[in-house]
């Protein structure tokens, strides 16, 4: 039975330009965290591996860093960053659990945090 | 050209271990991980492990883990798979294979070493 | 451990036939899922790779297709050099594992 559930920063908001720390957090679980894949609508960004460690998409080495932790930074953001994030913590021996994150990419300085969200 | 030799056949008594080797040449060994997969006779195709040349990190398949140990030689460009505790079942053809793409996770193995029979018999 | 399971094991056909192999991951594994062909004697050959992105130097007659847990790899006209055993791989999670292989056989 799957008793974690997976905190996100939830919707955020960044300067274009910026850079912006994407950030997923398991817990109420005792599960073993084998892998972490982040990735934007089904395009790899980086795969965090227990054994084998962080490995980011060439198509996304320039602009994007491993960490803190299991989270991933966005670097020289864009407007076309805009979109969804997903963090899939896989587990053993519950299985998958799935994370959302939506970023948006502003032009203008107003850009703010949003509150704090969770997903079972 | 790039390729992956492995050495010779062996023939092992139960208990004893194997340490089979991968030479690579044609391509920097650094940037690519290196799997072994096994197949027995008339069986098909095991993935036991990976290694990281570049910083020797590693992963192993559950089954093997605690008789298998994947190790390698920046110096001589070889990987190293040596498997510990032999039983009959562990006969086979043993191979090295490259990960397709450099520095990235390891989509498909690409080249692959010519195989090294591996025979368990009392 | 992700499962993979082939089917059918084993099949007959002709040359100049249309072949399809199927394969079915235990957990989704979007499209990481790699082809591969093998011979008696021989070491596996890599023909497709990420689900349907063909390897260099593999006939165009070879594709993949599928996403998730169903993924399908196509002959579209069987040569007779085609005849082996073919493999499908998982390359989402360690372990890495393979399919139980299914052998195409000359009808």
């Known amino acids: 039975m799957m008793t974690g559930t997976i905190e996100t920063t939830g919707n955020i908001s960044a300067e274009k330009g910026g850079s912006i720390i994407l950030q997923c957090h398991l817990s109420s679980t005792t599960a073993q965290v084998t892998q972490v894949n982040w990735e934007q609508q089904d395009q790899l960004l980086a795969i965090c591996n227990a054994d084998l460690g962080w490995h980011i998409s060439p198509s996304f080495k320039d602009r994007v860093a491993p960490g803190p932790g299991l989270g991933l930074t966005l670097q020289s953001l864009t407007v076309n960053d805009t979109g969804e994030y997903f963090c899939i913590y896989h587990t053993y021996p519950d299985g998958t659990y799935t994370g959302r994150i939506f970023l948006e990419v502003l032009e203008s300085s107003v850009a703010e945090h949003g509150a704090r969200f969770q997903i079972p | 050209q790039v390729q992956l030799v492995q050495s010779g056949a062996e023939v092992k008594k139960p208990g004893a271990s194997v340490k089979v080797s991968c030479k690579a040449s044609?391509?920097?060994?650094?940037?690519?991980?290196m799997s072994w997969v096994r197949q027995a006779p008339g069986q098909g195709l095991e993935w036991m492990g990976i290694?990281?040349?570049?910083?020797?990190?590693?992963s192993y398949a559950q089954k093997f883990q605690g008789r298998v140990t994947m190790t390698r030689d920046t110096s001589t460009s070889t990987v190293y798979m040596e498997l510990s505790s032999l039983r009959s079942e562990d006969t086979a053809v043993y191979y090295c294979?490259?990960?397709?793409?450099?520095?990235?996770?390891?989509?498909?193995?690409?080249?692959w070493g010519q195989g090294t029979t591996v025979t368990v018999s009392s | 451990d992700i499962q993979m399971t082939q089917s059918p094991s084993s099949l007959s056909a002709s040359v100049g036939d249309r072949v399809t192999i199927t394969c079915r991951a235990s957990?989704?594994?979007?499209?990481?899922l790699n082809w591969y062909q093998q011979k008696p004697g021989k070491a596996p050959k890599l023909l497709i790779y990420?689900?349907?992105s063909l390897q260099s130097g593999v006939p165009s007659r070879f594709s993949g297709s599928g996403s998730g847990t169903d993924f399908t790899l196509t002959i579209s006209s069987l040569q007779p050099e085609d005849f082996a055993t073919y493999y499908c791989?998982?390359?989402?999670?360690?372990?890495?594992?393979f399919g139980g292989g299914t052998k195409v056989e000359i009808k």
């Open positions: 290694i990281n040349p570049s910083g020797g990190s590693t």
């Open positions: 791989q998982q390359s989402l999670l360690t372990p890495f594992t």
């Open positions: 044609g391509y920097t060994f650094t940037s690519y991980y």
């Open positions: 990420a689900a349907s």
């Open positions: 957990q989704s594994i979007n499209s990481y």
């Open positions: 294979a490259r990960a397709r793409y450099p520095s990235s996770w390891p989509y498909g193995m690409d080249v």
